[in-house]
Structures are given as structure tokens and as C-alpha cells.
Interface confidence: low
């Protein structure tokens, strides 16, 4: 194989979790490197991660200008030798990608909870993403507003029957019975998505009322 | 610093299109909105539409039949065509950008960036 | 759509003083949607303040903005010769986008 052979990048996958998004493809390039390039629309290309032996570019800085465009990537190969031409090299296209859409949702993590009586009150961490605005990087409550929902899965520690609450806030206030234990889980949930409407559940936590001391797991005080 | 330059003709006779251009210097058209504001003699201020990047467009509702806003993204400019104008179509057109802006509920834009605006008269 | 009323339709004042433009909504508007403009005699509008109260790049703290829901207000603490314009609010919430009918600050 000479040096000049240069193969075309194939299986072009946009990874995206709460806004960070890496494009990612094959195959490992031997004796020639690659250029990606993003733009909101086919034209007006942005070169990202210039000639570069890796298989993967981290184009968040891109799309979190505004996350509600639809983004096409494209991989362009060229020769590891190469002197700029006017030639265009070969190249392939991305799927289009819109993040508002398309990145996934991050496992949540619960922040605290506190069972006082018939109440159970738990509260979900404020995910931070890498959308950045005046230099402060935003909530994923700040992008979804409203669309962004979590639902809760609860139960008793000593059953198996799971029951569900959902809130448009990071805060769920139910009912649940005096002196009994409760298991519970939470989820992001965007309803109005097509796909990639839920996240991974968070860990489980667990009241234990037999205590009345905090525990503190982490920075997180987690009261029962 | 981003400025916006605009063109097109003043003088348009009753049924004639309107067709305005607005060119985007020191900045991309990227991450942004483009609208079209436009301002009757001695009157306020009347929003006709906007267009992202990407070509997604908004129109006002009471001009949308009329009205149709493209961007060309190799230029980096974007354009307003008003279709059928009459002597009401009279004003001061602007090109303006919409810059996103996030907060706690939505995502929606201001307009930063104004082009000096562009006087078209409709008249036989 | 949400029609932006402005009140006073002028107002005359001397430099030095306060003024106080007024801007209702006929429908309740979210403040971030809401945005204020400077427009002088055959220039552009010039941003002064959105999300209803926060100042644009370069806007002198004298501009301060306030409200919520329906009512909404820009105070000038005290007037510079500069200041006297047409002040127009705006809102970028719902489509179609709507400015009010304008303020007049004239020198008094």
C-alpha cells in the first residue's frame, strides 16, 4: 500500500450525553490522517480536531452555540504527507444531529431525601451540561425547561410493587405510609422526544426510619 | 465585532416583489437567528421573521403569505423577499441578529446587532 | 399575539431627572422573553436591556430594568442629554415577536 492510499472514514456515530458530544468513527488510520468539519447546514464548514490520527473529535464547542440546529459532521482523509490543495479529499458524511433532540440524558443523581412521617421529599441533583453562557455553564433545567421531567420509581423496602410519581421540577413530595422503609430510583424523561427520551435510572437509594441520624454519602447529606 | 450591511431597491411600484439582502461581517451566521424588522414612516416597529443557520425559518403570521426570508451560508449574508407590495409595504426595513439566550424555562433570542436599515417606497 | 402597550406615549423631562416608561402586556409574558430598545432619529434600535432587566454590552448602569407577568417597566436614574430617544419594549417569546407602540423621552 503506498503513502498516498488514504481509506474513507466509515460508521460515523455522534456519542452525546447532556450536550457533550464526541463524533466517533473507523477505522484507524494508518499513514494518513484526518480533518472533521461541522456546520449547522452543508456549507459554511468548521474545521474541528485537524489532521489527527485519532478516531474520535470532541465538538461540543460547536454545537453548544446553539442546541437546537441540526449539526452534519464529515470525516475528510487525507495523506499523512500532505501539502494543502485544492483538491478535495475524500470525506464522509455524519447523520444529522440536533441536540436538543438527540444527546442523552445523563443518569441523574439523587441529591438528598428526607421521610418525615407520611411524606417522602427527594430531591434530584441539578446536572450541570457543557452548554456555557456568559461563561457559566447551564443546567439541564436551564436548556429543557419544562420538557425535562424525572419520574420516580418507589417502593416499599419490603415489597417488590413498584409505584411511579413524575415532575416538570427536580423535586418529588408523595405520600407513603408512617414508619415504613421505601426504595426508590429516579429517571430523566424528556415526553416530548421521539427518541432518547429517558436516562439511565439513578442509584437506589433507601429511608431507613429505624435511624434518626443523617448519613452523609459524598457531598450530599441524605436526611431520613 | 459583528455589523451587518443591507441592500436592495428603495423605489418599488404597487405589486412589485421587495427583495432586500443582509451581509453578516466579522461573525458567522452559525448559532444565531436573522430577522427582519421593519418600521413605517413616523410609526413603530414591526417584526416580519427570522431564519437560523440551518434555514429553519419564523414568519410573522400577518405577513407569512407574502414573505419569505433564505440565507446563504457560503455568502454569509441572508435576504427578505415581500411578494404583491403595496404603499402600506412603506418603511424602513432592518436586518437584525437574534442571539440565543438560555434561562430557566426556554431558549429564546434578542436582537444585538441591527444593519442601518434600508428606506423602501412603494408608489405608481 | 401579545399586544406590548406603552405609557407614557411622551414624556418630557429636563437632564438630571428620572424616567420611568411603562410597558403592559396584554397576555402574560415570561420576563426572560422581554427586551428593551434605544431607537434615536434615523438610527437603528440599539439594544438596552433584555431579559427584562439585565444591561446589554456597554449600557450605563443608569438603565435598569424591572417587572413581571404583564407589567413591566425601564427606569433612567437620571438623564443625560443622550438619553432623550424613542424606547421601545420588545417580546421574543411568542411568534410573532412584538415591539410596543414606543416611548418619546423629549428635553422638557
Known amino acids: 500500500t503506498g503513502t498516498t492510499d488514504v481509506i474513507v472514514a466509515y460508521n460515523l456515530t455522534w456519542k452525546s450525553t447532556n450536550f457533550k458530544t464526541i463524533l466517533e468513527w473507523e477505522p484507524k488510520p494508518i499513514n494518513y490522517v484526518y480533518t472533521v468539519q461541522i456546520s449547522p447546514r452543508l456549507g459554511d464548514w468548521k474545521n474541528k480536531c485537524f489532521h489527527t490520527t485519532d478516531t474520535e473529535c470532541d465538538v461540543t464547542d460547536e454545537i453548544m452555540r446553539n442546541v437546537k440546529e441540526t449539526y452534519v459532521a464529515r470525516v475528510l482523509s487525507y495523506p499523512a504527507d500532505t501539502v494543502l490543495t485544492a483538491q478535495e479529499p475524500p470525506f464522509t458524511n455524519s447523520p444529522p444531529f440536533t441536540p436538543y433532540l438527540d444527546t442523552n440524558l445523563g443518569q441523574p443523581v439523587i441529591q438528598s431525601f428526607e421521610q418525615v412521617g407520611t411524606k417522602l421529599n427527594v430531591t434530584v441533583e441539578a446536572a450541570r451540561t457543557l452548554v456555557r453562557v456568559n461563561g457559566t455553564f447551564l443546567r439541564l433545567r436551564d436548556v429543557f425547561g419544562k420538557d425535562l421531567n424525572y419520574t420516580l420509581y418507589y417502593w416499599r423496602a419490603s415489597s417488590t410493587g413498584k409505584k411511579k410519581a413524575t415532575t416538570n421540577t427536580n423535586e418529588f413530595l408523595i405520600d407513603v405510609d408512617k414508619g415504613e422503609n421505601y426504595c426508590f430510583s429516579v429517571q430523566a424523561v424528556i415526553p416530548s422526544r421521539r427518541v432518547n427520551q429517558k436516562s439511565p435510572e439513578s442509584r437506589i437509594e433507601c429511608t431507613s426510619q429505624e435511624k434518626a441520624v443523617s448519613r452523609e454519602t459524598g457531598h450530599h447529606h441524605h436526611h431520613h | 465585532q459583528v455589523q451587518l450591511q443591507q441592500w436592495g431597491a428603495g423605489l418599488l411600484k404597487p405589486s412589485e416583489t421587495l427583495s432586500l439582502t443582509c451581509a453578516v461581517y466579522?461573525?458567522?451566521?452559525?448559532?444565531?437567528?436573522w430577522s427582519w424588522i421593519r418600521q413605517p414612516p413616523g410609526k413603530g416597529l414591526e417584526w416580519i421573521g427570522e431564519?437560523?443557520?440551518?434555514?429553519?425559518?419564523r414568519y410573522n403570521p400577518s405577513l407569512k403569505s407574502r414573505v419569505t426570508i433564505s440565507v446563504d451560508t457560503s455568502k454569509n449574508q441572508f435576504s427578505l423577499k415581500l411578494s404583491s407590495v403595496t404603499a402600506a409595504d412603506t418603511a424602513v426595513y432592518y436586518c437584525?441578529?437574534?442571539?440565543?439566550?438560555?434561562?430557566?424555562?426556554?431558549?429564546?433570542?434578542?436582537?444585538?446587532?441591527w444593519g442601518k436599515g434600508t428606506t423602501v417606497t412603494v408608489s405608481s | 399575539e401579545i399586544v406590548l402597550t406603552q405609557s407614557p406615549g411622551t414624556l418630557s423631562l429636563s437632564p438630571g431627572e428620572r424616567a420611568t416608561l411603562s410597558c403592559r402586556a396584554s397576555?402574560?409574558?415570561?420576563?426572560?422573553?422581554l427586551a428593551w430598545y434605544q431607537q434615536k432619529p434615523g438610527q437603528a434600535p440599539r439594544l438596552l436591556i433584555y431579559?427584562?432587566?439585565s444591561r446589554a454590552n456597554g449600557i450605563p448602569d443608569r438603565f435598569s430594568g424591572s417587572g413581571s407577568g404583564t407589567d413591566f417597566t425601564l427606569t433612567i436614574s437620571r438623564l443625560e442629554p443622550e438619553d432623550f430617544a424613542v424606547y421601545y419594549c420588545?417580546?421574543?417569546?411568542?411568534?410573532?415577536?412584538?415591539f410596543g407602540g414606543g416611548t418619546k423621552v423629549e428635553i422638557k
Open positions: 420588545q417580546q421574543a417569546g411568542v411568534v410573532p415577536y412584538t
Open positions: 431564519i437560523g443557520a440551518s434555514g429553519s425559518t
Open positions: 397576555d402574560s409574558v415570561d420576563s426572560s422573553y
Open positions: 437584525a441578529r437574534d442571539t440565543p439566550y438560555y434561562y430557566e424555562g426556554g431558549y429564546y433570542y434578542y436582537m444585538d446587532v
Open positions: 466579522g461573525g458567522s451566521l452559525s448559532g444565531y437567528y
Open positions: 431579559g427584562a432587566f
